[in-house]
Interface confidence: medium
């Protein structure tokens, strides 16, 4: 179990409000605000790398020790690479020193170096090189030190800079306890972590009522380490058969509940759509008409297949249809509902019908759908379509009936324009197109999409009301992919096939590719 940390000082959480002492005043360490991950962050920073003989101190406020015997100091900081400065900054350093001083009272602004004892030289694992600095990649180092035993009422920490370019982003001081612990139905009391214990303190646990040490098992014991962690658990307690763990105690299973093994798990209520169980039952049978899927746990309610999708609409949009439906009114008690969409097309003239799975395109695979909508495209004009949406769940396979709803739609979409290349130059292509006259009255505009062959990253779009367009500002001797699509009030008509047209080369030669 993790140690319980009792925080005595947290610079990062204070939002720049602590007001630590800097010496000499106005030089060296400086409180700065920056932005990281769109949040303001405070740091104490110093970067006097060009001047030798630096001796800049930053002292925390006085920290009350309380019951702490050993304190832990966690530092988060960044150090800039001395080589990232012009000329290498010969007096530049890449470390700083950590000090502490104990006292029974707060000295305020009276700072005396001689009272401080060095804990360690703090060196970064990673320095911030020029490229990281430029890219705003903060190479954050985390170092932890501990000091103890402490005996006075409080203490200070101090940071000595001797010519580094360093920023302190977080200073956290805390001490540790082994927290009160309930583990495996055994209770262990809260224990203050000692300051300097060569061996682990053994703490005996006691089983809660109606919990026992399993036959052949050991009595529960834990060890409280210096860092406040419980270590080396030995033994455990488990609830007796027919009992469950309730608020760290063992309680008998009630009628209508079941628990089929001795374990740490609770007694489980007979789920919905099962027959009530007697006291001490190991399972609960399903009511008639309800089922369990092979993978369903015993704790899950018995369920049944869903009803049909409640409401199904088919909205035609040119060459596409958007199918939308609402979930079944009766889910059967399950959350694993999936939908399958099937398609049938009928020729209006002959009334002949057939499946159309292979000729249409779905926005996502039509079987095993979890969403309640799908778009069907590549529909043929002047065709009637019937779509069936079936709802299924994990127990649908246990019955023979199906739950589905159907919707029909007629496609009256424009035919694809027939495109021709009328003329070309080194930098332009003149393109025209036609569609059957009866359909022209429904067209609002034509959309011409073109791009260089082989360039899938960008394309150009021109809209026009006429039947031709000149595409200019093109590259010489270059093949362009051109497609024309009619736009109607109902949406997009069918697109023409993609044509390849090539501009002339500057010499005037070049083949016509249609």
């Amino acid at each position: 179990a993790q140690g319980k940390e009792v925080v005595l000082l947290d610079f990062a959480a204070a939002g720049g409000e602590l007001g630590w002492l800097t010496h000499p005043y106005g030089k060296g360490w400086d409180l700065m605000q920056n932005i990281m991950n769109d949040m303001p962050i405070y740091m104490y920073s110093v970067c006097n790398v060009m001047s030798g003989d630096q001796d800049n101190w930053l002292r925390t406020n006085w920290v009350y020790r309380g019951e702490a015997e050993r304190i832990f100091i966690e530092l988060k900081f960044t150090v800039r690479d001395c080589n990232s400065f012009p000329g290498g900054a010969s007096s530049c350093k890449e470390t700083f020193n950590l000090y502490y001083a104990e006292s029974d009272l707060d000295y305020g602004t009276n700072f005396q170096k001689r009272l401080f004892t060095k804990i360690d030289t703090i060196a970064p694992d990673e320095i911030t090189v020029s490229s990281d600095f430029e890219a705003r990649h903060v190479k954050l180092n985390v170092e932890e030190r501990s000091v103890g035993p402490l005996t006075r009422k409080g203490f200070y920490l101090a940071f000595q800079d001797i010519g580094a370019c360093v920023a302190l982003l977080s200073v956290r001081v805390y001490y540790k306890k082994c927290p009160e612990l309930l583990q495996s139905l055994a209770r262990f009391p809260e224990t203050i972590a000692g300051s300097d214990a060569p061996s682990l303190a053994t703490v005996a646990g006691t089983c809660v009522d109606h919990a026992v040490v399993p036959p052949g098992g050991e009595e529960p014991r834990m060890h409280c380490a210096v860092d406040g962690e419980w270590l080396v658990p030995i033994g455990q307690c488990l609830c007796q058969a027919g009992y469950e763990k309730v608020e760290d105690a063992c309680q008998a299973c009630s009628p209508g509940f079941f628990k089929f093994e001795v374990s740490e798990s609770p007694c489980l209520e007979c789920p919905e759509h099962t027959l009530p169980s007697p006291e001490g039952a190991t399972s609960c049978e399903c009511e008639e008409g309800f089922f369990r899927a092979p993978q369903d746990p015993m704790s899950m309610p018995c369920t049944r297949p869903p009803s049909a999708p409640h409401y199904l609409t088919a909205v035609g949009m040119g060459a596409k249809v958007e199918l939308r439906w609402t979930p079944p009114q009766d889910s059967g008690g399950r959350e694993d509902i999936v939908y399958s969409v099937t398609c049938e097309q009928c020729w209006p003239e002959s009334g002949e019908c057939g499946p159309c799975e292979s000729s249409v395109r779905y926005s996502e695979p039509p079987h095993g759908l979890t969403r309640t909508s799908v778009t069907v495209s590549d529909l043929e004009p002047h065709m009637n379509y019937t779509f069936t949406v079936e709802a299924r769940n994990g127990v649908s396979g246990l019955v023979t009936s199906r739950s589905f709803r159907t919707a029909s739609v007629s496609i009256n979409q424009t035919e694809p324009p027939k495109v021709r290349l009328e003329g070309r130059s080194t930098t332009s292509l003149s393109v025209s197109w036609s569609i059957p006259p009866p359909q022209q009255s429904r067209v609002w505009k034509y959309e011409v999409t073109y791009r260089k062959k082989g360039d899938s990253n960008s394309y150009n779009v021109r809209r026009t009301e006429g039947f031709s367009v000149t595409l200019d500002d093109l590259a010489p001797d270059t093949t362009y992919l051109v497609q024309v699509q009619a736009l109607t009030q109902e949406g997009q008509g069918a697109g023409s096939k993609v044509h390849e047209f090539q501009t002339l080369s500057p010499e005037g030669s070049g083949s016509l590719a249609v």
């Epitope: 700065m32 932005i35 303001p40 920073s45 960044t78 400065f85 600095f133 370019c165 360093v166």
Partner: antibody, heavy 128, light 107 residues
Framework: EVQLLESGGGLVQPGGSLRLSCAAS????????MAWVRQAPGKGLEWVSR????????HYADSVKGRFTISRDNSKNTLYLQMNSLRAEDTAVYYC?????????????????????WGQGTLVTVSS | DIQMTQSPSSLSASVGDRVTITCRAS??????LAWYQQKPGKAPKLLIY???NLHTGVPSRFSGSGSGTEFSLTISGLQPDDFATYYC?????????FGQGTKVEIK
């Protein structure tokens, strides 16, 4: 000595395009963040765009986003600004400017940059 | 965007005077502020970065101070070469906005 020399300015009609260049010398171009800053006649300075030392990331002022493109060729020590769909309000002297983090004596970089070195500027006039 | 407001927009002073220009940010920018000097027909020159750090080669009569939203540029002992327009610029946000400028003229 650091030198930045802009070129490519001139008179252009609204809706037209121009490409500005900035030739750099006297320093290691590939270490520098580069930027374009403009100054309309009789007005103050306006940051336009920036590009990182190795070509990214790029940022643009809202007023030029989607119309201007900043790029660089470190092998030629040259910075570019492709300006399309020009408007009358784009009329200004365009300065190329640079920043080298090595000369910035702070432990953690500022969120953006300032500009240590500037070119002499090139005038772009958008008028019909 | 962060707005930068300089005051005054212009001032008249004599050689040897102590001149202070202020710059106010519409929101806190810590100390991410630079000052530039520009003479007519010339490019701007960097004077101060990070609110108070003197750029290489800039005379020590120029000094900057402030943090958060209030900043100032001081010229202690104005020289003939110092008559120019001065701009502040924030670089806390990627929009990198400038103040509208302060013109220092000969009285």
């Amino acid at each position: 000595e650091v030198q930045l020399l802009e070129s490519g300015g001139g008179l252009v009609q609204p809706g037209g395009s121009l490409r500005l260049s900035c030739a750099a010398s006297g320093f290691t171009f590939s270490h520098y963040m580069m930027a374009w800053v403009r100054q309309a006649p009789g007005k103050g300075l306006e940051w336009v765009s920036r590009i990182g030392p190795s070509g990214g990331p790029t940022h643009y002022a809202d007023s030029v986003k989607g119309r201007f493109t900043i790029s660089r060729d470190n092998s030629k020590n040259t910075l570019y600004l492709q300006m399309n769909s020009l408007r009358a309000e784009d009329t200004a002297v365009y300065y190329c400017a640079g920043y080298d983090s090595g000369y910035d004596y702070v432990a953690v970089a500022g969120p953006a940059e300032y500009f240590q070195h500037w070119g002499q500027g090139t005038l772009v006039t958008v008028s019909s | 965007d962060i707005q930068m407001t300089q005051s005054p927009s212009s001032l008249s002073a004599s050689v040897g005077d102590r001149v202070t220009i202020t710059c106010r940010a519409s929101q806190s920018i810590s100390t991410w502020l630079a000052w530039y000097q520009q003479k007519p027909g010339k490019a701007p020159k960097l004077l101060i970065y990070k609110a108070s750090n003197l750029h290489t080669g800039v005379p020590s009569r120029f000094s900057g101070s402030g943090s958060g939203t209030e900043f100032s540029l001081t010229i202690s002992g104005l020289q003939p070469d110092d008559f120019a327009t001065y701009y502040c610029q924030q670089y806390q946000s990627y929009s990198r906005t400038f103040g509208q400028g302060t013109k220092v003229e000969i009285k």
